[in-house]
Amino acid sequence: GDLLIQKTIKKQVVLEEGTIAFKNWVKTGTEVYRQFWIFDVQNPQEVMMNSSNIQVKQRGPYTYRVRFLAKENVTQDAEDNTVSFLQPNGAIFEPSLSVGTEADNFTVLNLAVAAASHIYQNQFVQMILNSLINKSKSSMFQVRTLRELLWGYRDPFLSLVPYPVTTTVGLFYPYNNTADGVYKVFNGKDNISKVAIIDTYKGKRNLSYWESHCDMINGTDAASFPPFVEKSQVLQFFSSDICRSIYAVFESDVNLKGIPVYRFVLPSKAFASPVENPDNYCFCTEKIISKNCTSYGVLDISKCKEGRPVYISLPHFLYASPDVSEPIDGLNPNEEEHRTYLDIEPITGFTLQFAKRLQVNLLVKPSEKIQVLKNLKRNYIVPILWLNETGTIGDEKANMFRSQVTGKIN
C-alpha cells in the first residue's frame, strides 16, 4: 500500500502537463493577499530640526490581491529535466479588506532625498543636490498617498536631477505589467527529490549581491518542496523580495482544514549577527551602520536596489538588535503577528498555507551639505511599511486533498 501511494505521489508532484502539481503550479488555486501597514511619521519637524526619535504610528491593513496571474513562457527542457517560467506581477486593491482607500495620505521619509544623499557621497555633488532639493521644495519627509508610495509617483526633486535618471519613485515601482524571473526549476522527472528546486534565476546560479555562500540560490520558491518532508529537515528557499536565500525549520504540527501539516518558521538565528551565527558573516556588507557586524535583524539589500539604501527586516524590527529600533518610537514586535511561517503538507511537499511578513526600511544619514539632513546627529533605519502576504488552501481544494492524498494514507 505505502509503496503504491509513494509511487502515485512521486508521479503527481512532477512539474509536467497532466499532474495535480503542475495545474496548481502554473496558476495557484489559492487566493493570495498582500496586506500593507504604513508607518505614518507623527513628528517630522522635530526629527529634521532636532534629530529626535522618529515617532511612528502604523496604519493598515491596506489589502491587495496578488499572485493571481498564471506563470508565463512555461518551457520544458527534456535534456536537463527543468522547466523555466516568468512569474508575472499584478496587484488589485481590495477595499472591503482595507481600512481606507488608495488615496489615503501618509507622512513618510522622502525616498528620493534619502537615496540620493546616500548614493552621491561627494561633497560637491551634495551641494548640487541640496540646491535641487531646495528648488523643488522637497524635505526630509513628504506626504504621499498609498498609491503613490507603493506603485510610484513623479518626484519633484529627481525631475531636476540631470539626465539620465528615473524620475518615478515607489517602493514597488514598477510592479504591474512586470514579471519576476526567468526561473528555471527542476521538474522532478528524473529525480523527485529535486522537484521545484531552482536551478537558475535570471540565467545564473548566483545572485552577485553577496560574497561566498550567501550569494547562492538555494532551494525552491517556497510554494512547494520535494515530497516526503521530514520534521528534521531545514527547508531552503529563495525569495527575490529580499534578494537572498533563507531557510525555515519545523516548529509544530498543525491541523489545517482536516489536513495534517507541518508548520515551518523562519528562526531568529537566520537574522542573527555573525557574532551569534557565523554563517551570516557574508550578509554583513559594511562596518559602520552594522556597528562592525554586531547589529542584527536588518539586511542591507542596497546592492540589489541600484545602490538605494534599502534595508529589509521583520515587521516592527522583530528579532533585531536594540540599537536598530532605539531611534524609532511606536514599534511593538511580537512573534505571532510578525514572523513568517509555512504550513507544508509533508507527503506532497505542497505549501497549503503561509504568511510571509517583511518590513521595508530606508537608511537616512546626516549630511553637512544637504540642508534638510544637516541637523541629524545619527543614522536612522526608517521603517516605511510592513507587509503580510498570506494564502490558505480553499475549502474545495482541501476536500479534494483530504480525499485524494491524506485520506488514502490514513
Partner: nanobody, 118 residues
Framework: QVQLQESGGGLAQPGGSLRLSCAAS????????MSWYRQAPGKERELVAL????????DYADSVKGRFTIARDDAEKTVSLQMNSLKPEDTAVYYC???????????WGQGTQVTVSS
C-alpha cells in the same frame, strides 16, 4: 575626453563687473547640471551658481543672489557667469563644473582668478 576651460577672470573694482566663461568639450552641456564654484584663500570651495539641464532651472548662493547670473549656450557649448556689483569678498578662484546622475563626482575646470580690489 571631457574638458572645461574657464576664462574672463581678472582684476575688478568694487561695484564693477566681470563675465566668466566656461568652454566645454567632449560632452553635451545641455544634459548636465553646470555650476560655478569658488574658493577663497583659506576657505572651503562653495557652490555659487547652478543651471540644470531640466528646464534650465537656476539657483544661486544667498551671498550672490541678485548680483550674479548664470547662463548656458548649448549651441556654443559654453556656460557664463555674469558678475555685477562685485565686492571684495567675491575675491576667489572660480571653477566651472559639470555633473549628471551617472557621475559620482563632478568634472572640473582648472579655475580662473577673480580679484576685487580698489
Amino acid at each position: 575626453q571631457v574638458q572645461l576651460q574657464e576664462s574672463g577672470g581678472g582684476l575688478a573694482q568694487p561695484g564693477g563687473s566681470l563675465r566668466l566663461s566656461c568652454a566645454a568639450s567632449g560632452f553635451t552641456v545641455s544634459t548636465y547640471a553646470m555650476s560655478w564654484y569658488r574658493q577663497a584663500p583659506g576657505k572651503e570651495r562653495e557652490l555659487v551658481a547652478l543651471i540644470t539641464s531640466a528646464g534650465g532651472i537656476t539657483d544661486y548662493a544667498d551671498s550672490v543672489k541678485g548680483r550674479f547670473t548664470i547662463a548656458r549656450d548649448d549651441a556654443e557649448k559654453t556656460v557664463s557667469l555674469q558678475m555685477n556689483s562685485l565686492k571684495p569678498e567675491d575675491t576667489a578662484v572660480y571653477y566651472c563644473s559639470a555633473w549628471r546622475a551617472t557621475l559620482f563626482k563632478p568634472y572640473w575646470g582648472q579655475g580662473t582668478q577673480v580679484t576685487v580690489s580698489s
